[in-house]
């Protein structure tokens, strides 16, 4: 037989299919010009010493073969003895290692079988009603196609699906979308309405992320507040490594996950902007305020579930940094100014109450006064910190108040509102005999003691009503008891206690009159 013709003799090997897993597959045959045809196939398995034979059976029942040798592609003309206007059945037999391996058969009319291309170029992927929609430009001069897809996940084999007939300049396919695993898709096409026409090759892989982007495993650590009133937020991040199907490993466009950091500054609600979104790689500096931090993971289908953490406020207080003077017109605070043209946010809330009850006031940008101090004043009528109770005050500063990450903490401290000197007066001062010349003086803790750092000391005063001489004695703020000794029997004394702050002298308690009885010996 001539090599250019289909040989109508028995092939030069025994007729027996080994049924092995390897062998020829994916046979495609089509017209490539007015009178020339091509068949190509894949061979799976070791290729050494393998000989391929393209078999063809005509509708009359006569069969022939082409010897392709080790090649997996073969061309022939319409003069090679194969009928091109009528239906023929083709398959490949591969002779290897003393056994024959057969491909699946294709039955087709060769003249009408056009070589179809898989989707070429950009395949657009989108989500539609919980499904995946793929769309692509129809290859030139190939309108009218049947389209199939196959898809697999990292843990499952290929599954075949049908896209249905296509008859337009753009083609599309609806495919299943997985919630939590990445998928690899491939598409192939064949001529529509041409009975038995060959499928194109599979397209390049289309890698599709899961519908829900994986949440990052993130740990935050916050440094201590620095001298500049800022603390660095550090992200110890191990983004979840998305497991990818085989064809998507390496460079897998489409499966990328981006992580963003959303900061919400909870303190100082009167400022202009409370939230800011940053790239996860950018480590922001925060003030000592309380924040909620969300990590948002997104893929091409949009954002996934948020993970939110609460970063509590830094409650380190500076008891001496804030000077408060109370006058008839109102109250003024003074603190060391940060720099020129700073906006300050003064926030206060009653101690022991929910953070939602914080009140704040934003100052206009101000320069330091000649003493290097910044100030904030309010009138009694405003009612700010007007109740006689303990307030927690935080002052924040920013040269750019519209930028959330540029706020810094100036100071945090406690302040007793209202008329502190009167409200702090110790009550329930009691005098008890201790010995022949001494008494024990006790008092209930001042209301100021509920306000950390506010109560500087108690002062106990004892007055000798005979000589009118007075002694005063300071007592640490943690103590509420002292013993007076060296008292003389029969002399009247009065004792009073007051509570002082760093800025205010307290009001004396009501005088307690007492005397030690004269001991009459028998």
């Amino acid at each position: 037989c001539r090599t250019s013709e289909c040989c109508f003799q028995d092939p030069p090997y025994p007729d027996a299919d080994s049924g092995s897993a390897s062998g020829p597959r994916d046979l495609r045959c089509y017209r490539i010009s007015s009178d020339r045809y091509e068949c190509s196939w894949q061979y799976e398995g070791p290729t050494a010493g393998v000989s391929h034979f393209l078999r063809c059976c005509l509708s009359s029942g006569r069969c022939c073969y082409f010897a392709a040798g080790s090649a997996t592609r073969l061309q022939f003309s319409d003069q090679a003895g194969v009928s091109v206007l009528y239906t023929v059945t083709l398959w490949v037999e591969s002779w290897a290692r003393n056994q024959t391996e057969k491909s699946p058969e294709v039955t087709l009319q060769l003249y009408n079988s056009v070589k179809y291309e898989p989707p070429l170029g950009d395949i657009k992927v989108s989500k539609l009603a919980g499904q995946l929609r793929m769309e692509w430009e129809t290859p030139d001069n190939q309108v009218g196609a049947e389209v199939q897809f196959r898809h697999r996940t990292p843990s499952s084999p290929w599954k075949l699906g049908d896209c249905g007939p296509q008859d337009d300049d753009t083609e599309s396919c609806l495919c299943p979308l997985e919630m939590n695993v990445a998928q690899e898709f491939q598409l192939r096409r064949r001529q529509l309405g041409s009975q038995g026409s060959s499928w194109s090759k599979w397209s390049s892989p289309v890698c599709v992320p899961p519908e829900n982007p994986p949440q990052p495993q993130v740990r935050f650590s916050v440094e201590q507040l620095g001298q500049d009133g800022r603390r660095r937020l550090t992200l110890k991040e191990q983004p979840t490594q998305l497991e990818l199907p085989e064809g998507c490993q390496g460079l897998a466009p489409g499966t990328e996950v981006t992580y963003r950091l959303q900061l919400h500054m909870l303190s100082c609600p009167c400022k202009a902007k409370a939230t800011r979104t940053l790239h996860l790689g950018k480590m922001p500096y925060l003030s000592g305020a309380a924040y909620n931090v969300a990590v948002i993971s997104s893929n091409q289908f949009g954002p996934g579930l948020n993970q939110t953490w609460h970063i509590p406020a830094d409650t380190h207080t500076e008891p001496v940094a804030l000077n408060i003077s109370v006058g008839t017109n109102g109250t003024t605070m003074y603190w060391p100014a940060r720099a020129q043209s700073m906006t300050y946010c003064i926030e206060w809330q009653p101690v022991g109450q929910d953070g939602g009850l914080a009140t704040c006031s934003l100052t206009a940008p101000q320069d330091p006064d000649p003493a290097g101090m910044a100030t904030y004043s309010w009138s009694r009528e405003s009612g700010a910190m007007g109740q006689e109770k303990c307030y927690y005050i935080t002052i924040f500063a920013s040269a750019h108040p519209e930028k959330l990450t540029l706020w810094s903490t100036v100071l945090s401290t406690y302040h007793f509102g209202g008329n502190a000197s009167a409200a702090g007066t110790p009550h329930h001062v009691s005098v008890k005999n201790h010995s022949l010349d001494s008494v024990s003086v006790d008092w209930a803790p001042s209301l100021l003691s509920t306000c950390p750092g506010v109560l500087k000391e108690y002062v106990v005063r004892c007055r000798d009503e005979d000589s009118k001489q007075v002694s005063e004695h300071p007592v640490q703020p943690t103590e509420t008891q002292v013993t007076l000794s060296g008292l003389r029997a029969g002399v009247a004394y009065t004792v009073q206690v007051r509570a002082d702050t760093a800025w205010l002298r307290g009001v004396w308690s009501q005088p307690q009159r007492f005397s030690i009885e004269v001991q009459v010996s028998d």
Partner: nanobody, 126 residues
Framework: QVQLVESGGGLVQAGASLRLSCAAS????????MGWFRQAPGKEREFVAA????????????NYKDAVRGRFTISRDNAKNTVYLQMSSLKPEDTAVYYC???????????????WGQGTQVTVSS
């Protein structure tokens, strides 16, 4: 500079009394607050009692550890430059080395002492 010397310690039965003395050198004794502290084996030094310096009406402000209040009395004699600790109803848990201290500090009632004596041993047996 103030030098302090304690005396009066010893071994006594539970329920007995002892009087500790602390003699101070220096002309400004009356302006110092004086205190007694104690240290039991394996424990930290703790405050026992203190007495203020002199006041215009010669009234002294004193303070006691709760566990000794009512049993111990601190007093001073500025003429003799001496401070005393009268201890009665002694208990085994009062066993310790007792130290005398002196301070010019504003708050003398529990700590912040500048000068210390060498200590005197008090042992209370049951």
């Amino acid at each position: 500079q103030v030098q302090l010397v304690e005396s009066g310690g010893g071994l006594v039965q539970a329920g007995a009394s002892l009087r500790l003395s602390c003699a101070a050198s220096g002309r400004t004794f009356s302006s110092y607050a004086m205190g007694w502290f104690r240290q039991a084996p394996g424990k930290e030094r703790e405050f026992v009692a203190a007495i203020s310096g002199g006041t215009p009406n010669n009234i002294y402000y004193t303070n006691y550890k709760d566990a000794v209040r009512g049993r111990f009395t601190i007093s001073r004699d500025n003429a003799k430059n001496t401070v005393y600790l009268q201890m009665s109803s002694l208990k085994p848990e009062d066993t310790a080395v007792y130290y005398c201290g002196a301070t010019m500090g504003r708050y003398w009632n529990t700590g912040g002492y500048d000068y210390w004596g060498q200590g005197t041993q008090v042992t209370v047996s049951s």
